[in-house]
């Protein structure tokens, strides 16, 4: 199961910080970063880094402890750029996170200094059971306002 | 001001477990998280785990997993640390201490110390 | 795990006069938000450690100024500018980068 999350300010749901997906082991979260054609909009390119945080992190919206993981960066606004993230309980990867059913984690972005973006949340929840490939609902949309 | 009051001191036999109280004050207790450090008799400290009140998640230390427990009860704003299987080494004095948030992330206000001794 | 390795082992010093003590750790702390996680604490003969300094460089309040924090990477310093009777105890540097969050091994610090 592939989870598509549009990550972009003009997703009301990111922005309230009421977003969550329910993911089980296997499944991705495919994190898709604004994307534009021509000059973008007036107020500049949204641009940002994604990190995983702890719960007073996800609150305060802040990225600095030492629970606050840098995941990726969403900085090539006018490139089509998506991130995933498998969750999974084992990781072979050193960079990899490790899920635990039942659990949840959190995203936030932080906007860089010269970026338009706002401050963007969401919740993953852990599901129990491992599943087949298969596709989701995507959380917002490339231009939802 | 800010306190953590833990137990008494505690004698068990090997194979046996403990479970060590730390009484939080003068802040909110569901705001911050707990930490637990323990120091053998002459030695250096040593990191155990930690727990965030807030949503009761847990982070131990590989070395004490399977053994370890860290509890809390919002309701007494107390933390509790149980290590079970005691060995001879694992006597020493725990300490519980809280860790402050932005911009610190340090563990800023430690208890008094539980001593443990583990003994036949 | 990381290990956090201080030198020297004890210091004894003129009250009076500077020590330095140093931490070296087997991986930089550089965390990947961009931070580093690298604390000193104090620990006084029959007390609880005591927060000196955290993130490297930052007196935490209370601190007196002669305590200063300093280093990057893997190689950090404690430095004490004028050692005061009341400064002695064991110095623990410690970090948080990293899981498990691991201590130095401790420097004694006595006056001569």
């Known amino acids: 199961l592939r989870h598509v999350v549009y990550w972009n300010s003009s997703n009301p749901r990111l922005l309230r910080g009421d977003a969550v997906v329910e993911l089980g082991l296997n499944d991705y979260l495919d994190i898709v970063c604004p994307h534009y054609e021509g000059p973008g909009p007036p107020e500049g390119p949204e641009t940002f880094a994604l990190y995983m945080v702890d719960w007073p992190g996800y609150e305060s919206c802040q990225a600095e402890g030492p629970r606050a993981y840098k995941r990726w960066v969403c900085s090539l606004p006018f490139g089509h750029v998506q991130f995933s993230e498998k969750i999974q309980r084992f990781t072979p990867f050193s960079l990899g996170f490790e899920f635990l059913p039942g659990e949840t984690y959190y995203y936030i972005s932080v906007p860089t200094p010269e970026s338009s973006g706002q401050c963007l949340r969401l919740q993953v929840s852990v599901c129990c059971k491992e599943r087949k490939s298969e596709s989701a609902h995507p959380v917002g949309s490339p231009g939802e306002s | 001001q800010v306190q953590l009051v833990q137990s008494g001191a505690e004698v068990k036999k090997p194979g046996a477990s403990v479970k060590v109280s730390c009484k939080a004050s003068?802040?909110?207790?569901?705001?911050?998280?707990i930490h637990w450090v323990r120091q053998a008799p002459g030695q250096g400290l040593e990191w155990m785990g930690w727990i965030y009140p807030g949503n009761f998640n847990t982070k131990y230390n590989e070395r004490f997993k399977g053994r370890v427990t860290m509890t809390t009860d919002t309701s007494t704003s107390t933390a509790y640390m149980e290590l079970r299987s005691l060995r001879s080494d694992d006597t020493a004095v725990y300490y519980c201490?809280?860790?402050?948030?932005?911009?610190?992330?340090?563990?800023?206000?430690w208890g008094q110390g539980t001593s443990v001794t583990v003994s036949s | 795990d990381i290990v956090m390795t201080q030198t020297p082992l004890s210091l004894s010093v003129t009250p009076g006069q500077p020590a330095s003590i140093s931490c070296r750790s087997s991986?930089?702390?550089?965390?990947?938000?961009?931070?580093?996680?690298l604390y000193w604490y104090l620990q006084k003969p029959g007390q609880s450690p005591q927060l000196l300094i955290y993130?490297?460089?930052n007196r935490f309040s209370g601190v007196p100024d002669r305590f200063s924090g300093s280093g990057s990477g893997t190689d950090f310093t404690l430095k004490i500018s004028r050692v005061e009777a009341e400064d002695v105890g064991v110095y623990y540097c410690f970090q948080a980068t990293h899981v498990p969050w691991t201590f130095g091994g401790g420097t004694k610090v006595e006056i001569k």
């Open positions: 993130r490297v460089s």
């Open positions: 003068g802040y909110t207790f569901t705001g911050y998280y």
């Open positions: 991986q930089s702390l550089v965390h990947s938000n961009g931070n580093t996680f």
């Open positions: 201490a809280r860790e402050d948030g932005s911009p610190y992330y340090a563990m800023d206000y």
